[in-house]
Interface confidence: low
């Protein structure tokens, strides 16, 4: 189905306008900001979601990187250019003609330049490390229970194939979820790890993108899992290209 038929809403994206515009009066939903039709049976791409949210502020984040080539989204929110399939265009520019290259999750991977900057291809982010710190609990969570619950969450809520959840690490109070998805592994119809990570990030912040659902109520064996900090690292198939001055 394209969207909920009964009341014509988009279950997977509340940042849409829906009406019975489709063939045979079927409900069709378009993303705010871009006006692009979205498939409400799956997650909307991060690019279209960012475009819809372009006016909302977002805190910048910095921490020590877990690897030499890992990227953190320090630039915050911007109004992205998306291709006709809703993916980020490799080159992004702002209103003042400052341009930069991004990866498949829309995170800057080069120094900023001018309109002459070329970004030959959209480099795929194939490994995402979601680093969470949970609030103090009476005791540590059971690792295997935590692992099972987070895998279930990604499978059922975000429709991410279980094979893309590579690992769940736990050292109280830190939880790390590893998502891995190479270009060759991603089949047509598979949810992108970048989109799943973005939906999860928004859920964790209490800003769910799902229509009409309550916020994320994450429990491990009945015990609430409340996250107090989230940090997401992105690793690309090709290392980013930053000048040395940025690394000092």
């Amino acid at each position: 189905h394209t969207a909920a038929q009964d009341n014509c809403t988009c279950p997977t994206n509340k940042m849409t306008v829906c009406s019975p515009d489709g063939p045979g009066g079927r409900c069709q939903c378009r993303a705010l900001g871009s006006g692009m039709a979205v498939d409400c049976s799956t997650l909307t791409s991060k690019c279209l979601l960012l475009k819809a949210r372009m006016s909302a502020p977002k805190n910048a984040r910095t921490l020590v990187r877990p690897s030499e080539h890992a990227l953190v989204d320090n630039d915050g929110l911007y109004d992205p250019d998306c291709d006709p399939e809703g993916r980020f265009k490799a080159r992004q520019c702002n209103q003042t003609s400052v341009c930069w290259c991004v990866n498949s999750v829309g995170v800057r991977r080069t120094d900023k330049g001018d309109l002459s900057l070329r970004c030959d291809e959209l480099v795929r982010t194939h490994h995402i490390l979601i680093d969470l710190r949970h609030r103090p609990t009476a005791g540590a969570f059971n690792h295997s229970d935590l692992d099972a619950e987070l895998r279930r969450l990604f499978r059922e809520r975000y429709r991410l194939h279980p094979k893309f959840v590579a690992a769940v690490h736990y050292e109280q109070p830190t939880i790390q979820i590893e998502l891995r998805q190479n270009t060759s592994q991603k089949a047509a119809g598979d949810v992108d790890i970048g989109d799943a990570a973005y939906y999860f990030e928004r859920d964790i912040k209490g800003e769910s993108l799902f229509q009409g659902r309550g916020g994320l109520d994450l429990r491990v064996r009945g015990e609430p899992l409340q996250v107090e900090r989230t940090l997401i690292y992105y690793l690309d198939e090709i290392p980013p290209k930053f000048s040395m001055k940025r690394l000092t």
Partner: antibody
């Protein structure tokens, strides 16, 4: 089905103004941009400007700035093009066309039938 | 402004022929080029957008390619209903600009 229906042909004198309407149906008006393009007899297509129906903000081609106004009535899903200080060179078929909001989507997937505006003394 | 130069300006061909129309942008427009077909007295119809994406309902004999400054519309096997004027348009940056058109006539 999705369609754009434009107002009828107009004959105007030089110096006068004309207002062409474009009524949208079959889709949610505020989820797509509305563009205006004109075509002089036997000539090619010329972009005049567009309006973001979500924000109501118009943008005009430099050649028409000061003479053109693009506006909306979202309650009736109608866009308007007003052109003032008409000259004989403004004789053309004026089209409204639907597009997306961002540069990736500034192609025109649905067109109105066109409104012939003739400027003659 | 970005100029879009189409070639040829007119073309004679027969049913069944393979036809190619080219469009050259005066500066890099990435893949933001659309192609339209227009018949006499009618509004243009969208065929291709973003250089290579065929619009809904457009027959598979129409295809588009190119990036940067050079773009091509190909009709693999001409049908009688394909004789019309074809326009390219860049949708990279405003002002949006069109090519001058290519008139495809029956030989």
């Amino acid at each position: 089905q999705v369609q754009l229906v434009q107002s009828g042909a107009e004959v105007k004198k030089p110096g006068a103004s004309v207002k062409v309407s474009c009524k949208a149906s079959g889709y949610t008006f505020t989820t797509a941009g509305m563009q205006w393009v004109r075509q002089a007899p036997g000539q090619g297509l010329e972009w005049m400007g567009w309006i973001n129906t979500h924000s109501g903000v118009p943008k005009y081609a430099e050649d028409f700035k000061g003479r053109v106004t693009i506006s909306l009535d979202t309650s009736t899903s109608t866009a308007y093009l007003q052109l003032s200080s008409l000259k004989s060179e403004d004789t053309a078929v004026y089209y409204c066309a639907r597009s997306g909001f961002g540069s990736s989507y500034w192609y025109f997937d649905v067109w109105g039938q066109g409104t012939l505006v003739t400027v003659s003394s | 402004d970005i100029q879009m130069t189409q070639s040829p300006s007119s073309l004679s061909a027969s049913v069944g022929d393979r036809v190619t129309i080219t469009c050259k942008a005066s500066q890099d427009v990435s893949t933001a080029v659309a192609w339209y077909q227009q018949k006499p007295g009618k509004a243009p119809k969208l065929l291709i957008y973003s250089a290579s994406y065929r619009y809904t309902g457009v027959p598979s004999r129409f295809s588009g390619s190119g990036s940067g400054t050079d773009f091509t519309l190909t009709i693999s096997s001409l049908q009688p209903e394909d004789f019309a004027v074809y326009y390219c348009q860049q949708h990279y940056i405003t002002p949006l600009t069109f090519g001058q058109g290519t008139k495809l006539e029956i030989k």
